[in-house]
């Protein structure tokens, strides 16, 4: 605590500004204004990331206005140093006390590298499991933004369920944060809009994302399944392919079944929906099967879950590794696909 | 030009700095320093994006040092205004002349949202056209006065060919810059490494990307082609599907041919290579064909161009919309796929 017989200084750093195009000048001046103190000896030190800098302080100038004094000290930095994100501190010692102000290059204000995405529920979760969830995904965060806040709301103003949060470091040195919110099947189908608001002290403005049931025309998927013939050198393995196309909207879930049991998602690889030449979408799904599986039961089912499929939001197609001859003839003659 | 009987002012804007964590303060002060002029009447006006601002200038203070005067005028802005990327100008009228300095928020300096990618030549360009090119792609640039520089080099130190450059403004307001470099077929096949160096005034460090022929094991693609059966309501259209799999490395070109003529790439949709459960990759390609096409000639060819395919780096597979019965039987009996 300062004793009463002197007025302590205020320490404030000003900096040279960028030009009218927002470009950094080749050198950056930091001006340390030490103002409003009772005249007396003051000591100014500049620190870079906490380390004392070797700076010529003979340029510091002191002026007196009435009973109070002010001192200015200038530090010149190369653009490269300034852009390297170091912290600069002007430390003032006066009457045995220390006063300081610190600065660094302003954090990038445009969250260009920070993106937020809000998914819709998968048709499988919505129509089969009947426990739909939506996920708010925030990517390209720095580790210090791990405390990013994701808050949920509904356009109707009704309360939201409890959400679960996950944090993951990506291989490119960025952070991904997800928040998953369970939604009511009926609420979703009836067109409720859900909002995810992303805030963090370093983000100049909140990122808002909203999601609701897709509007527009509906079309049920066509499902076709194929088996590859035997390939030299791989007698005990075959690939099954499923083409699902001309569906609208693009939300779809694809499953493979064998022996009336759904195979784990990790077993197959399904592409992202892509636009057809018309107005619909298509996906391909690929499943590798073993001789043991097809010898146990040579029927595999590719199933699409989609809101426009009737009666139960699913369309499926069976395929065999070794189809009977008559099946082949039938299809060659252009019979209906099921 | 100023007459000799007065010294004109220097106009310089300083700004309040961000704190030691790089955070913007709630309000930003711009300080216009008008210094070193022969005492006389001066008029200070602040402009925002070229428009005169309604600012209380009574706070401007003038001091005299020896024979020259200095004046300071302060403008306080909300963080929101400052972050909205407007340009602020301190305009000084003195002895019938105008002197000014402009500033705006410094452009984001961290290339957080800036990514650079360097492609390898497509197998089609490399093996069929024999005129391979590589492309350096820089995305998520903020449009600004500083131009992005893409320079090419070879690890061997040998000279590079002349490159072509393209700039494209994306709908999200960012800039994409590409530079395409022709490379020697032999140089590439023999393992030359090419580097693309991306520099820009706003990037604190150059982005470097290098590319060379992929190392590791090789495997030729398996190619399978299928036609969908007729679907109710679309008698005059069919979809052909091509599954190309178990190839290594992942670089592949896919083409469709009809009547010995290659169809334009825009006609088909081919997925990005994805990993199989083993060590190889797979792609799917989808082509919509019309009755007019299959009635003219009912044979369509799916061709893969890949470095491991022999003898001529291509593997192809024919498919018909209405296959003859014997073709179908043959395949059902598990004959070799071609």
């Amino acid at each position: 605590v300062c004793s009463r017989d002197f007025t302590p200084p205020t320490v404030k750093i000003l900096q040279s500004s960028c030009d009218g195009g927002g470009h950094f000048p080749p050198t950056i001046q930091l001006l340390c204004l030490v103002s409003g103190y009772t005249p007396g000896t003051i000591n100014i030190t500049w620190l870079e990331d906490g380390q004392v800098m070797d700076v010529d302080l003979s340029t510091a100038s002191t002026t007196q206005e009435g009973e109070l004094a002010s001192t200015q000290s200038e530090l010149t930095l190369s653009q490269k140093h300034w852009l390297s994100d170091r912290t600069y501190t002007c430390q003032v010692t006066y009457q045995g006390h220390t006063f300081e102000d610190s600065t660094k290059k302003c954090a990038d204000s445009n969250p260009r590298g920070v993106s937020a995405y809000l998914s819709r529920p998968s048709p499988f979760d919505l129509f089969i499991r009947k426990s739909p969830t939506i996920t708010c995904l925030v990517v390209d965060l720095a580790p210090s933004k791990g405390t990013v806040n994701l808050t949920w709301s509904r356009a109707s103003g009704k309360p939201v369920n409890h959400s679960t949060r996950k944090e993951e470091k990506q291989r490119n040195g960025t952070l991904t944060v997800t928040s998953t919110l369970p939604v009511g099947t009926r609420d979703w189908i009836e067109g409720e809009t859900y909002q995810c608001r992303v805030t963090h002290p370093h983000l100049p403005r909140a990122l808002m994302r909203s999601t609701t049931k897709t509007s527009g025309p509906r079309a049920a998927p066509e499902v076709y399944a194929f088996a590859t013939p035997e390939w030299p050198g791989s007698r005990d393995k075959r690939t099954l392919a499923c083409l699902i196309q001309n569906f609208m909207p693009e939300d779809i879930s694809v499953q493979w079944l064998h022996n009336e049991v759904q195979l784990p998602d990790a077993r197959h690889s399904t592409t992202q929906p892509r636009k057809t030449k018309g107005s619909g979408f298509f996906v391909f799904s690929r499943l590798e099967v073993t001789r043991a599986e097809w010898e146990q039961k040579d029927e595999f089912i590719c199933r699409a879950v989609h809101e426009a499929a009737s009666p139960s939001q699913t369309v499926q197609r069976a395929v065999s590794v070794n189809p009977e001859l008559d099946v082949c003839v039938e299809e060659a003659e252009g019979e209906a696909p099921w | 030009v100023c007459s000799r009987d007065f010294t004109p002012p220097t106009v310089k804007i300083l700004q309040s700095s961000c704190d030691g964590g790089g955070h913007f303060p709630p309000t930003i002060q711009l300080l216009c320093l008008v210094s070193g002029y022969t005492p006389g009447t001066i008029n200070i006006t602040w402009l925002e994006d070229g428009q005169v601002m309604d600012v209380d200038l009574s706070t401007a203070s003038t001091t005299q040092e020896g024979e020259l005067a200095s004046t300071q005028s302060e403008l306080t802005l909300s963080q929101k205004h400052w972050l909205s990327d407007r340009t602020y100008t301190c305009q000084v009228t003195y002895q019938g002349h105008t002197f000014e300095d402009s500033t705006k928020k410094c452009a984001d300096s961290n290339p957080r949202g800036v990514s650079a990618y360097l492609s390898r030549p497509s197998p089609f360009d490399l093996f069929i056209r024999k005129s391979p090119t590589i492309t350096c792609l820089v995305v998520d640039l903020a449009p600004s006065k500083g131009t992005v520089n893409l320079t090419w080099s070879r690890a061997s130190g040998k000279p590079v060919n002349h490159s072509t450059r393209k700039e494209e403004k994306q709908r999200n307001g960012t800039l994409t810059v590409t530079s395409t470099l022709p490379v020697g077929t032999r140089d590439w096949i023999e393992g030359e490494t090419y580097q693309c160096r991306v520099t820009h005034p706003h990037l604190p460090r150059a982005l470097m990307r290098s590319t060379t022929k992929t190392s590791g094991p090789r495997a030729a693609p398996e190619v399978y082609a299928f036609a969908t059966p007729e679907w109710p309501g679309s008698r005059d259209k069919r979809t052909l599907a091509c599954l190309i799999q178990n190839f290594m490395p992942e670089d592949i070109s896919v083409q469709w041919l009809h009547n010995e003529v290659q169809l334009p790439d825009a006609r088909h949709s081919t997925t990005q290579p994805r990993k199989t459960k083993g060590s190889g990759f797979f792609v799917f390609s989808r082509l919509e064909v019309t009755r007019a096409e299959w009635e003219q000639k009912d044979e369509f060819i799916c061709r893969a161009v890949h470095e491991a395919a022999s003898p001529s780096q291509t593997v192809q597979r024919a498919v018909s919309v209405n296959p003859e019965l014997d073709v179908c039987v043959e395949e059902a009996e598990g004959e070799a796929p071609w």
């Epitope: 990331d49 912290t87 580790p143 405390t147 291989r171 040195g173 | 957080r112 490494t193």
Partner: antibody, heavy 119, light 111 residues
């Protein structure tokens, strides 16, 4: 300048636990991931795991999941690794290393702490 | 886990000559246009020091006689011309997949 100052050498008995520290200075501690790496005498380097000091979120190499516990204290700019149920296989030099945002490498390392496990 | 195999295990090179160290990965360390391979060297009693990141980028302050190349599974570190101070153990590191792994090291001796 950036510095990662690690605590001194430890001699521990089999079955015991040790806590090693890594004090960061010269930069904003919570802006970077802190990783730990093990190096047995005359052997190669093994990645143990990392912590995000801001959130305390950790990821481990499965091999060290039951061996190491990573923590961080933002107020003292210090990261810690606790090694439990020590055996002679845990005798090694342990390094802390800093990973930056958008970087997937270690530009800064601590000087290392030698842990010797002996009866 | 991705296994990195370095060769040779040790290497003796005359002053001013070229040293070449190879690192082979058990699977590709490329992802989405980037290569997640780094090189470090380590002198006795010291921590490793970053030389090259992302396969071919020289870290600041590292002399230009060091260079890295490669993509996918095969990578090379070259030092030319070799100087006395380059005597050290060299490690490659992949950061494409958890757990991050290091090569077994190559000990460089100057003749």
């Amino acid at each position: 300048q950036v510095q990662l100052q690690q605590s001194g050498a430890e001699l521990a008995k089999p079955g015991a636990s040790v806590m090693l520290s890594c004090k960061a200075s010269g930069y904003t501690f919570n802006g970077y991931w802190m990783h730990w790496v093990k190096q047995r005498p005359g052997q190669d380097l093994e990645w143990i795991g990392y912590i995000n000091p801001t959130t305390g979120h950790t990821e481990y190499n499965q091999k060290f999941k039951d061996k190491a516990t990573l923590t961080a204290d933002e107020s003292s700019n210090t990261a810690y690794i606790e090694l439990s149920s020590l055996t002679s296989d845990d005798s090694a030099v342990y390094y802390c290393a800093r990973q930056e945002y958008r970087h997937s490498w270690f530009a800064y390392w601590g000087q290392g702490t030698l842990v010797t496990v002996s009866a | 886990d991705i296994v990195l195999t370095q060769s040779p295990a040790s290497l003796a090179v005359s002053l001013g000559q070229r040293a070449t160290i190879s690192c082979k990965a058990s699977q590709s360390v490329d992802y989405d246009g980037d290569t997640y391979m780094n090189w470090y060297h380590q002198k006795p009693g010291q921590p490793p020091k970053l030389l090259i990141y992302a396969a071919s980028n020289l870290d600041s302050g590292i002399p230009a006689r060091f260079s890295g190349s490669g993509s996918g599974t095969d990578f090379t570190l070259n030092i030319h011309p070799v100087e006395e101070e380059d005597a050290a153990t060299y490690y490659c590191q992949q950061t494409n997949e958890d757990p991050w792994t290091f090569g077994g090291g190559t000990k460089l001796e100057i003749k």
